[in-house]
C-alpha cells in the first residue's frame, strides 16, 4: 500500500546505522511540511449529465475548490485526439454571460460553480465533440482547468444519470478531511520540530521501545484518509454512438471507465491512454461511463457569438461590445 512505503524510513535503525538516525527522524516533518504546503492547491471538478427528459441534451456542471473568488469561467469543447476546440460559454461575475451554440443556458449555480445546458441534435450533437473543459480564473492567484471526456462506445449502456448529491458530499468530505489532516499534521510538525530542537542527537533504541515506530504507524492512516477524503469526484455517464466520427475508437464492452486527475488534465488523450491511468491519490477525478443515445453528426463549425447577453444573477447586465474573431 502506498502509505506503507513511507513507514520504513521512520522505523528504528538497525545496529550500526547511528549516523542515519537524524536523517530518518526528519523524513516525517518534511513529508508533513510538503502536505501543508500542497494541500491548499485549488482544483476543478467537472460533471456531465444526460437529461432524463431529453436524450439529446445534457448538462455540464463545473466547480472550483479553492479559497479565491472567481473572476472568470470558460467552458470549451473539442474533438478527440487534440483536435481544435471552441468556446461554449464565458461567465464573468460582473460583466455577464456569453454563450455560443449549441449551448442553451449557462448560469452560475453558486459563487464557485456553474452549469451549462447543451442542445444536442444533428450536427450540434454533443457526441460530435467528445471533450469538455472548464477553466476557472481567480485573479490574481491564477487559473485552473479540468476536462471531462465523452468517449464513443460500442453499446449505449443502461446506466442511469447520476445525481449531483454525491458530488456535493464528496466536496464537503474533501474539505473537512483535508482540513482535519492538515490541522493534525501541522500541529504535529510543530511538536516534532520543537522536540527536535530541545533534544540532543537521538540514541539507538530497541524497536519495542522506540517512540518513532508507533508514531509512524499512527500517521500512516492519516495520510491514507487524506488521500481518500480529498477526492471530490464526478461521474460522467456517457456513451455516444456517433454517426460520422472519424476518430471513433471501438470498445469491447458496454461501459468504458477511465480516471482523470483534473488538476493535471492539460491535454486530453485518447481513451486508450486514459484507460490505464491509475486513480490519483490526491485530486479530483472524473470517471466516465454513461448512456447517451444522441446521434452524432459532423463537428459543427465555430459559430459566431449570440447577440443576446445573459445577465448574471450576481452582477449587472453585461455590456454588449463589438463582435470579436469568433
Amino acid at each position: 500500500m502506498r502509505t506503507e512505503a513511507q513507514v520504513p524510513a521512520l522505523q528504528p535503525p538497525e545496529p550500526g546505522l547511528e549516523g542515519a538516525m537524524g536523517h530518518r527522524t526528519l523524513v516525517l516533518p518534511w513529508v508533513l511540511l510538503t502536505l501543508c504546503v500542497t494541500a491548499g492547491t485549488p482544483e476543478v471538478w467537472v460533471q456531465v449529465r444526460m437529461e432524463a427528459t431529453e436524450l439529446s441534451s445534457f448538462t455540464i456542471r463545473c466547480g472550483f475548490l479553492g479559497s479565491g473568488s472567481i473572476s472568470l469561467v470558460t467552458v470549451s469543447w473539442g474533438g478527440p485526439n487534440g483536435a481544435g476546440g471552441t468556446t461554449l460559454a464565458v461567465l464573468h461575475p460582473e460583466r455577464g454571460i456569453r454563450q455560443w451554440a449549441p449551448a442553451r443556458q449557462a448560469r452560475w449555480e453558486t459563487q464557485s460553480s456553474i452549469s451549462l445546458i447543451l442542445e444536442g441534435s444533428g450536427a450540434s450533437s454533443p457526441c460530435a465533440n467528445t471533450t469538455f473543459c472548464c477553466k476557472f480564473a481567480s485573479f490574481p492567484e491564477g487559473s485552473w482547468e479540468a476536462c471531462g471526456s465523452l468517449p464513443p462506445s460500442s453499446d449505449p449502456g443502461l446506466s442511469a444519470p447520476p445525481t449531483p448529491a454525491p458530488i456535493l458530499r464528496a466536496d464537503l468530505a474533501g474539505i473537512l478531511g483535508v482540513s482535519g489532516v492538515l490541522l493534525f499534521g501541522c500541529v504535529y510538525l510543530l511538536h516534532l520540530l520543537r522536540r527536535h530542537k530541545h533534544r540532543p542527537a537521538p540514541r539507538l533504541q530497541p524497536s519495542r521501545t522506540s517512540p518513532q515506530a508507533p508514531r509512524a504507524r499512527a500517521w500512516a492512516p492519516s495520510q491514507a484518509s487524506q488521500a481518500a477524503l480529498h477526492v471530490p469526484y464526478a461521474t460522467i455517464n456517457t456513451s455516444c454512438r456517433p454517426a460520422t466520427l472519424d476518430t471513433a475508437h471501438p470498445h469491447g464492452g458496454p461501459s468504458w471507465w477511465a480516471s482523470l486527475p483534473t488538476h493535471a488534465a492539460h491535454r486530453p488523450q485518447g481513451p486508450a491512454a486514459w484507460a490505464s491511468t491509475p486513480i490519483p491519490a490526491r485530486g479530483s477525478f472524473v470517471s466516465v461511463e454513461n448512456g447517451l443515445y444522441a446521434q452524432a453528426g459532423e463537428r459543427p463549425p465555430h459559430t459566431g457569438p449570440g447577440l443576446t447577453l445573459f445577465p448574471d444573477p450576481r452582477g449587472p447586465r453585461a455590456m454588449e461590445g463589438p463582435l470579436g474573431v469568433r
Epitope: 470549451s76 487534440g82 481544435g84 464565458v90 460583466r95 456569453r98 477553466k135 485552473w144 486530453p268 455590456m319
Partner: nanobody, 127 residues
Framework: EVQLVESGGGLVQPGGSLRLSCAAS????????MSWVRQAPGKGLEWVST????????SYVDSVKGRFTISRDNSKNTLYLQMNSLRAEDTAVYYC????????????????????WGQGTMVTVSS
C-alpha cells in the same frame, strides 16, 4: 495550474522589429482563443490582437493593423506576436492572455477579464 510565460521583449529603435512569444502550459491550449493586450506607462490596458482557437481568424486594433501579426502553434502550445515598423507609442508591457475581450466589450479592460494571463514582457521603442 495554468501558466502563460511571455518572452521576446526588449529595447528596439523606431522602425525595428520584435517577435514576442508566449509559452502556455497547464491547460488545453488548442481549445481557447488567445489575445495580446498591452499597458503603456501610466495608461490603462489596451487590446492589441486576438486569434481564434485554430488560428483561422485574427483581428487587430486599428493602430497596429498592417504592422503586427498574431499567430499560434498549437502543437507547441505557443502564441506569437510579430511586431514590425515599431513606433514610440508601441512602448508598453505586453501581456499574453486567454480569451477574447470582445466578449464583454473593450472598455475598462482589466487582466481579471481574461481566463488566464502572463506576467508580461516590456517592449521599449526608443532611439
Amino acid at each position: 495550474e495554468v501558466q502563460l510565460v511571455e518572452s521576446g521583449g526588449g529595447l528596439v529603435q523606431p522602425g525595428g522589429s520584435l517577435r514576442l512569444s508566449c509559452a502556455a502550459s497547464g491547460f488545453t491550449f488548442s481549445y481557447y482563443d488567445m489575445s495580446w493586450v498591452r499597458q503603456a506607462p501610466g495608461k490603462g490596458l489596451e487590446w492589441v490582437s486576438t486569434i481564434n482557437s485554430n488560428g483561422g481568424r485574427t483581428s487587430y486594433v486599428d493602430s497596429v493593423k498592417g504592422r503586427f501579426t498574431i499567430s499560434r502553434d498549437n502543437s507547441k502550445n505557443t502564441l506569437y506576436l510579430q511586431m514590425n515598423s515599431l513606433r514610440a507609442e508601441d512602448t508598453a508591457v505586453y501581456y499574453c492572455v486567454e480569451g477574447d475581450p470582445h466578449n464583454f466589450g473593450l472598455e475598462n479592460l482589466s487582466l481579471r477579464d481574461f481566463g488566464s494571463w502572463g506576467q508580461g514582457t516590456m517592449v521599449t521603442v526608443s532611439s
